[in-house]
Interface confidence: low
Amino acid sequence: HNTTVFQGVAGQSLQVSCPYDSMKHWGRRKAWCRQLGEKGPCQRVVSTHNLWLLSFLRRWNGSTAITDDTLGGTLTITLRNLQPHDAGLYQCQSLHGSEADTLRKVLVEVLADPLDHRDAGDLWFPGESESFEDAHVEHSISRSLLEGEIPFPPTS
């Protein structure tokens, strides 16, 4: 699995989307887990409703919510009041019995609040983000959760 990078601003909400084949995963509940180390276990954060037909209902665990569009094939996770300690590796999972299939690997990056308008100093100058081989970035950097994709790394 390639890794998809989602960037959010500290203190704001970040939406992570995980597309999947709705037919292949028909009838399966979904989950959002946090990867503990590169090869460690994935610790469950939140999962969809126990009744698959009610998967569209948003379920919360603390500041993290999950909802599943089972017809459209999109799992959506919302991280509310994003904090620096939320940065890290996560997975969207499709559950069947005691097994879990990975739908998407996600790296959450937390940016400082852009309303902090202090000058970045002489070291930095604006530029365009270029290509990489392993993942891609989905920005969520405005208060309206405007998403725009940077080819930073493209998925293969």
Epitope: L89, L107, V110, P114, G121, F125, I141, S142
Partner: nanobody, 112 residues
Framework: ESGGGLVQPGGSLRLSCAAS????????MHWYRQAPEKERELVAL?????????NYAGSVKGRFTISRDNTKNMVYLQMNNLKPEDTAVYYC?????????WGQGTQVTVSS
Amino acid sequence: ESGGGLVQPGGSLRLSCAASGFAFSNYVMHWYRQAPEKERELVALIGSQGGAYTNYAGSVKGRFTISRDNTKNMVYLQMNNLKPEDTAVYYCNVVYNGRPNWGQGTQVTVSS
């Protein structure tokens, strides 16, 4: 950035990047490189705060290590077992105020 130079194949270099003017510890930092006639490519990234989360391009995995010192506002790239194909200008990068920002770059040349 600093720490670049000429090194023989199999050698090592440590690149450093000093940042200022923003809350460094809250930002994910990246190292990119650009070889002549090639696109700029992401080499490594490190998460904010303690920097426990790292990710590497497949071509450098196991040879390069990214780290950061939030007390000094520094990010580093330790490069071991260098190969001629690692020759490039290396840049550190941060996404600041919603846009990518680049350092001035440091040249790394791997040649015998």
